[in-house]
Interface confidence: medium
């Protein structure tokens, strides 16, 4: 049965969805304001934002005493959505405040904007990885999903219509399919990764879905507004249940496992693509792209990234 | 629970200044963003301003913006409103608000479900 691992504010909990007495286990716990999550499965790695401390953070599950590092400390606002990138091995994340959304190494290091321009209030980010493209929510004054390659390239709004507060956002890898709520108009819809073929999952009868995840036929999400987690059929909606209650503040939610990030081998994988700083994953030949930091020029041969780097 | 209890209403003419005080008991003050709500006679209750919980980012309605400054003294368990350039249109009962978190946009600060904790009110008149 799948580990859903959450985001709680002050603190960062695992709950197994299948488990006969269904009591969370805290990974993380004294912070201030824990927003977004997501995990590196092959390392044991969790990260999660702060919105109130204003940063990236991260700990090592399995390590008893793991200590907490710091990953980003400069420059956040407002860090709603979060995102990791296990086979590119990046961190992609959302700033609802600063506008922006940001990529840079698992450390770190190599921060670059991706994109500042007609942003109103970004929050969730799901990556796939295996067709290279990365896909948000917006819920300001024009709501929308949009979709670009983790490299950037190619953005498109694939859902502006029936939208208002899309929170939650999740990705079937298997299925490819995406997934998002909307906090507003109370449902849970889904459609090709295109945007096209849209259907209801669940309607009108939630109260404030904020994050969703999904494990094999079944989704999960949080609830702001009822403080609980709950899952339905991924298809029909139906066999809805309360899988945990009584929570202080469940915010962002991820299944925890290895099915939801299968690797493969990339081309950044072989001397990080050839690049000198950042190797992204990208939707068109070769399906990747070398990239610099904000601020830091790119040389002519496309690899390797000027001085002052 | 946190009890809320707002002092520093009262009758001023227009182009003056108030300063609304909203005191805190019951609980850590420095865990919950505050913020300030209005209602005006006949209307819903309005959002005015937030702050963070750690005082470092504030929000503004766009109608108060330029003219109204939250702030907060985490010390003294106390959120203030400083009310400059006052209008007649500024004439409501003025609520102090707490909640764990605070959102940057307006549609959350507005959504009243969203702040847990309640004053119970403090008069504002603009009259001449």
């Known amino acids: 049965s799948p580990l859903l691992l959450f985001a709680n504010r002050r603190d960062v909990r695992l709950v197994d969805a299948g488990g006969v007495k269904l009591e969370s286990t805290i990974v993380v716990s004294g912070l201030e304001d824990a927003a977004a999550v997501d995990f590196q499965f092959s390392k044991g790695a969790v990260y999660w934002t702060d919105v109130s401390e204003e940063a990236i953070k991260q700990t090592y599950l399995n390590q008893t005493g793991a200590a907490v590092q710091n990953v980003v400390i400069s420059g956040l606002v407002s860090p709603d959505g979060l995102a990791c990138d296990w086979v590119g091995k990046k961190l992609y994340w959302t700033d609802s405040e600063t506008n922006r959304i940001e990529v840079a190494n698992l450390n770190g290091t190599s921060r670059k904007v991706l994109f500042w321009q007609d942003l109103d209030q970004p929050r969730a980010i799901a990556l796939d990885p295996a067709h290279g493209y990365m896909y948000w929510t917006d819920w300001g004054e024009t709501p929308r999903i949009e979709r670009a390659g983790m490299d950037g390239s190619t953005r498109k709004i694939i859902v502006d219509s029936d939208i208002y507060w899309p929170n939650g956002l999740t990705i079937d890898l298997e299925e490819q399919k995406l997934y998002w709520a909307d906090a507003k108009l109370s449902f849970i819809h889904r459609a090709n990764l295109d945007g096209s073929f849209r259907q209801k999952v669940v309607e009108g009868s939630l109260t404030h879905p904020f994050a969703l995840t999904l494990s094999g036929d079944t989704l999960y999400w949080t609830d702001w507004q009822t403080r609980s987690i709950h899952a339905c059929n991924k298809r029909t909606g139906g066999k809805r249940k309360e899988i945990l209650s009584a929570l202080y503040s469940p915010m962002d939610i991820q299944v925890l496992s290895q099915e939801r990030q299968p690797f493969f081998h990339t081309r950044c994988e072989e001397d990080n693509g050839g690049c000198s700083h950042l190797c992204l994953l990208s939707p068109s030949e070769p399906f990747y792209t070398c990239a610099c930091p904000t601020g830091v020029q790119l040389q002519d041969n496309g690899r390797t990234c000027k001085a002052g780097a | 629970a946190v009890q809320l209890v707002e002092s520093g209403g009262g009758l001023v003419q227009p182009g003056g200044s108030l300063r609304l005080s909203c005191a805190a008991s019951?609980?850590?003050?420095?865990?919950?963003?505050m913020g300030w709500f209005r209602q005006a006679p006949g209307k819903e209750r309005e959002f005015v301003a937030a702050i963070r919980r750690s005082g470092r980012r504030t929000y503004y309605a766009d109608s108060v913006k330029g003219r109204f400054t939250i702030s907060r003294d985490n010390s003294k368990n106390t959120v203030y409103l400083q009310m400059n350039s006052l209008r007649p249109e500024d004439t409501a009962v003025y609520y102090c608000?707490?909640?764990?978190?605070?959102?940057?946009?307006?549609?959350?600060?507005?959504?009243?479900?969203?702040?847990?904790?309640w004053g119970q009110g403090t008069l504002v008149t603009v009259s001449s």
């Open positions: 608000a707490a909640a764990r978190r605070v959102r940057s946009s307006t549609r959350y600060n507005t959504g009243t479900w969203w702040w847990e904790y």
């Open positions: 019951g609980g850590t003050f420095s865990s919950y963003a």
